[in-house]
Amino acid sequence: FNISGCSTKKLLWTYSTRSEEEFVLFCDLPEPQKSHFCHRNRLSPKQVPEHLPFMGSNDLSDVQWYQQPSNGDPLEDIRKSYPHIIQDKCTLHFLTPGVNNSGSYICRPKMIKSPYDVACCVKMILEVKPQTNASCEYSASHKQDLLLGSTGSISCPSLSCQSDAQSPAVTWYKNGKLLSVERSNRIVVDEVYDYHQGTYVCDYTQSDTVSSWTVRAVVQVRTIVGDTKLKPDILDPVEDTLEVELGKPLTISCKARFGFERVFNPVIKWYIKDSDLEWEVSVPEAKSIKSTLKDEIIERNIILEKVTQRDLRRKFVCFVQNSIGNTTQSVQLKEKRG
């Protein structure tokens, strides 16, 4: 098809070589002032189209994306040639950064419903560059955390080194939907809820004497609970004695609840105390048996092939620790009577 009638948009993706980041292209820009996006050639600029063929309608999931090869070859279907690019409804997701993503991307509806729809397409010229300015070493991350129940903010990585006063107007999207009230380089959240989690996109315009570009950055925001203020607690064993049968195999389980920590280095281990001696036991790897936003429940077992008389004189101690502190629970084995 002839792409000369497509509306054109230029985008710039400046990626950090230090971090993994994603990028997105939207097939349409659902802003009221973009209503000429799928302009119908017969309308004068003052006329308002009565219905835009696929803007804001359900057809949006039914768009086709192409890349225009720089050598003038025919358009290539994104889905067939680019495994690191994923189409999700009307959004194109670039999973890995790199200058090889530079190029022209075209999207149009799959269903052409009328002769006017032929020109209903968008051409996006994407330029991808690695970040060079070392002047801003504290630029916002492309992965940002918000603390549930508290006040927080989401910063636009490409503008986070500028003060609010000198920052240009920013257009924000969350999960592909325009956030029309947000225009600054930072979204302030008065109280963080789990629905604030998602993929945020911030755009601003950068112009020179020749042309203007949309500078875009993508931020993955997750909502987290605050770091625990508690040391882990041992859920099992509860009792400090355990009845056993001599000569039989035995497994003692230690289950501990660890509260959330952003930097999480849990310790859960078994050691044996025998009179004045104590030593750590080589036991199977610890495993999580439950995982929630607030905590991980981690289990580690000690396995005795057969219980001996000597084991009855020993104490088996489970030791658990996080950055706050540690807890222990000891178990004394007692021979079952009768």
Epitope: R222, I224, F260, F264, N265, P266, V267, I268, E285, A286, K287, S288, I289, K290, S291, T292, L293, K294, D295, E296, I298
Partner: nanobody, 115 residues
Framework: DVPLQESGGGLVQPGGSLRLSCRAS????????MGWYRQAPGEQRHLVAT???????NYGDSVQGRFTISRENNGNVVELQMHSLKPEDTAVYFC?????????WGQGTQVTVSS
């Protein structure tokens, strides 16, 4: 975040087999749930298979009987053995882990089934 490293994608003929592997590094314990999801062009991400440390396995409808998920010594390596592959299995396959109740995703590995 816990980094997930995937390997084993590629091009395979219909009816062929492929094995995907994913390792979660830097964690001092076995993560509760690990698994695989896939995303075909123009579609949402769909469950392929997951396995918990308790041995509970869950498969997506379309792969039941053809794909097998396993965890090496119940540790932080999850493997997906795929047999009788069909063109409709073509997708980007993402490793997934649940860590403090949150989804963690790998970068994805492309699987293409084509003659």
């Amino acid at each position: 975040d816990v980094p997930l490293q995937e390997s084993g994608g590629g091009l395979v003929q219909p009816g062929g087999s492929l094995r995907l592997s994913c390792r979660a590094s830097g964690v001092g314990f076995s993560i509760y749930t690990m698994g695989w999801y896939r995303q075909a062009p123009g579609e949402q991400r769909h469950l392929v298979a997951t396995v918990t440390t308790g041995g509970h396995i869950n498969y997506g409808d379309s792969v039941q009987g053809r794909f097998t998920i396993s965890r090496e010594n119940n540790g932080n390596v999850v493997e997906l053995q795929m047999h009788s592959l069909k063109p409709e299995d073509t997708a980007v396959y993402f490793c997934n882990a649940i860590y403090f109740g949150q989804d963690i995703w790998g970068q994805g590995t492309q699987v293409t089934v084509s003659s």
